[in-house]
């Protein structure tokens, strides 16, 4: 109770009371002091006596404490994908008896839902409400409507507002759990078929067969097939077990194999399902190609005269395919070039670039040439090799080695002498000239003898026909 100070300038004090008069109530000196923050209702009882009659005992005085903020309470809720739910107590509650009775109590939407809308039951359904009255909530006219998107959660924030007494609630957030619904059918996006070798087993690549579904994972997209007309479908790791279903996830993992049997052109009919919706009547085409085999004939040995140029010929190198491929499409690649000379093209003789590719047709035309480069040291016979790779897609590549034999023993039209040097001699008329090693050198005959033993040997020139216009 408020009691005045003894002196005029002394401030009034607050004293707890056991009794008070009607006059004290009338003058506003009896106060209720709220001291427990979370307790919003209270009561006390009185015995009222006037001195005239029997006192009134146990008069109950009930108190409602008005919180500083409107006590708006929220409860999270679930809604099916694309579904709706009425926002009514107990999902949305203003506790206590006082605030819900205020005519001006309204709710403001501070943050609207991202994947849905707050709508009035009978109002326009275009967009979300920005505010609505508590009366509408009580009459169950406000609902949350999910937009049907493939989202698992949504949220919105509300704040209560009592305009007539300038009070508000704290912002209250609602979390909406969206229960997914399998409402989207699977769509076959790619069905290009498969090309493979006859009799082979090959994966059905995801690039050849793919489907999508907005609300199903790849492991839930199931292809169910009928009898393939030219083979069998098996899973990697179980080639002996034929299967009639596989998933997009298995295709993505390269686990679905087609094993070809029978006709070259065929495939299988299939249906596509996500467990809820089925898309029937599809066909996956499997086209098998007969294996093209490359073969290499010819001696694969080239005999070259020292220091000369020799064309490769069909006797040396002759490629063909089981499909009768055009020689222009039989391609050789030089994997490792010659060590003792060079390979070049007759029409594109550039001394710089080494020849890397040539065709069988060019071999037939005699346009691929091997040129032997004379070494500084004499030799009788030398061996070179060329490593080639024959290719003609779609056949498998074939490796080939071309052996080159460079020998003084061979009959060489470009080089009549078998000797390392036999240049002949220029002699002025009536005079003499020295025959030196620069003009006549048969040391290549000793090239096969190991160096340490060469001193034990010598080359003997025996004159079988003497000069007729001079003498040795």
């Amino acid at each position: 109770m408020v009691s005045r100070g003894a002196l005029a300038d002394e401030p009034p004090s607050l004293d707890p009371v056991q009794s008070f008069s009607q006059e004290a109530v009338d003058t506003g000196r009896v106060l209720y002091l709220h001291s427990r923050p979370e307790a919003w209702s209270d009561a006390f009882s009185l015995d009222v006596a006037s001195g005239l009659g029997a006192p009134l005992e146990g008069v109950l005085v009930e108190l409602e404490v008005l919180p500083a903020a409107i006590p708006l309470e929220a409860q999270n809720f679930s809604v099916p994908e694309g579904g709706s739910l009425t926002l009514a107590p107990p999902l949305l509650r203003v506790s206590g008896p006082y605030f819900p009775t205020l005519l001006g109590l309204s709710l403001q939407v501070l943050e609207p839902p991202q994947h849905g809308a707050l709508q009035k039951e009978d109002g326009p359904q275009a967009r979300t409400l920005s505010a609505f009255s508590w009366r509408m909530v009580e009459e169950q006219l406000i609902r949350y409507v999910h937009d049907g998107s493939e989202t698992l959660t949504d949220s919105f924030v509300l704040m209560a507002n009592a305009s007539e007494m300038d009070r508000q609630s704290h912002p209250v957030a609602f979390t909406v759990t969206v229960l997914p619904v399998n409402d989207q059918p699977p769509i076959l996006t790619t069905n290009t078929g498969l090309q493979m070798w006859e009799g082979a087993t090959a994966p059905i690549p995801a690039e050849a067969l793919r489907s999508t579904d907005g609300d199903s994972g790849s492991e839930d997209l199931v292809y169910t097939i009928e009898q393939p007309s030219n083979g069998r479908v098996v899973l990697r790791g179980a080639p002996g077990t034929e299967v009639r279903s596989f998933t997009q996830a298995q295709l993505d993992g390269g686990l679905v194999l087609f094993s070809h049997r029978g006709t070259l052109d065929g495939g299988f009919r299939f249906r596509l399902s996500d467990g809820e919706h089925t898309s029937p009547g599809h066909f996956f085409r499997v086209t098998a190609q007969k294996q093209v085999l490359l073969s290499l004939k010819g001696s694969q040995t080239l005999t070259v005269c020292p220091g000369s140029v020799q064309p490769l010929s069909s006797q040396t190198l002759r490629a063909s395919s089981s499909a009768g491929t055009d020689p222009q499409l039989l391609l050789y690649r030089v994997v490792r070039g010659p060590q003792l000379g060079r390979l070049f093209h007759a029409q594109q003789d550039s001394t710089g670039e080494a020849l890397v590719n040539f065709t069988q047709a060019e071999v037939y035309a005699g346009n691929i040439l091997y040129e032997h480069e004379m070494p500084p040291e004499p030799f009788w016979e030398a061996h070179d090799t060329l490593e080639l790779q024959l290719s003609s897609p779609p056949a498998r590549d074939v490796a080939a080695t071309l052996a080159v034999a460079v020998s003084f023993e061979a009959a060489c039209p470009q080089r009549p002498s078998h000797l390392w040097k036999n240049k002949g001699l220029w002699v002025p008329e009536g005079q003499r000239a020295r025959i030196t090693v620069a003009a006549l050198d048969a040391s290549n005959l000793l090239a096969s003898v190991p160096s340490p033993q060469r001193s034990e040997h010598d080359v003997l020139f025996q004159v079988t026909q003497f000069p007729s216009r001079g003498q040795l």
């Epitope: 169910t224 009928e226 007309s229 030219n230 083979g231 034929e242 299967v243 279903s245 596989f246 029978g262």
Partner: antibody
Framework: QVQLVQSGPEVKKPGASVKISCKAS????????MHWVKKAPGQGLKWLGW????????TYADDFKGRFTITLDTSARTVYLEISSLRSEDTATYFC??????WGQGTLLTVSS | EIVLTQSPATLSVSPGETVTLSCRAS??????LHWYQQKSGLSPRLLIK???DSISGIPARFSGSGSGTDYTLTINSVEPEDEGIYYC?????????FGQGTKLEIK
């Protein structure tokens, strides 16, 4: 309409061979696999094997590998089940079926000495 | 091979009752499961294919459900002519296999 007609009942001695036929009509024969099922007295259905009617490739259940052979005559639209070295336990009704729905009427094979 | 286990082995019900037959596979069979009814001396009759697809000419009281490894055949308001043995068949991978069967008796 679709029909699978099987050959008539057979009575054979142990050690002999038998060839049961199943003739299809009313659909594209090479579109659907043909299966054989065994139903022995007092027992359930047992899947025996099937043949790919497009490729002619048969597949057998483990219990039926060896003495059982499934073959095909595409021009006659007929599938055959041949059982060699017959035993008394081969006594049963053998059904052919195609694409789940279509079943033959069954062929009763009795193996008895 | 995939093993199919049917339950119960035998079932005795009165006309009008609803019956649920179960078929469990030893691994996922991607709904490649078909239900058959066989009456004594007759060929099996397809009731449901691919787990839940209905068959024309089969009464609507027969329905199928399930996925993965667990499948169910439901017969609503059983009739006396429904007596027989019911088999499930998996057609997912070779060898195809039947369940051991459920015998349905009508009281």
């Amino acid at each position: 309409q679709v029909q699978l007609v099987q050959s008539g009942p057979e009575v054979k001695k142990p050690g002999a061979s038998v060839k049961i036929s199943c003739k299809a009509s009313g659909y594209t024969f090479t579109d659907y696999s043909m299966h054989w099922v065994k139903k022995a007295p007092g027992q359930g259905l047992k899947w025996l094997g099937w043949i790919n009617t497009a490729t002619g490739e048969p597949t057998y259940a483990d219990d039926f590998k060896g003495r059982f052979t499934i073959t095909l005559d595409t021009s006659a639209r007929t599938v055959y089940l041949e059982i060699s070295s017959l035993r008394s336990e081969d006594t049963a009704t053998y059904f052919c079926f195609s694409y789940y729905d279509y079943w033959g009427q069954g062929t009763l094979l009795t193996v008895s000495s | 091979e995939i093993v199919l286990t049917q339950s119960p082995a035998t079932l005795s019900v009165s006309p009008g009752e609803t019956v649920t037959l179960s078929c469990r596979a030893s691994q996922t069979i991607y709904k490649n499961l078909h239900w058959y009814q066989q009456k004594s001396g007759l060929s099996p009759r397809l009731l449901i294919k691919y787990g839940s697809d209905s068959i024309s000419g089969i009464p609507a009281r027969f329905s199928g459900s399930g996925s993965g490894t667990d499948y169910t055949l439901t017969i609503n308001s059983v009739e006396p002519e429904d007596e027989g043995i019911y088999y499930c068949l998996q057609g997912y991978s070779t060898p195809w296999t039947f369940g051991q069967g459920t015998k349905l008796e009508i009281k």
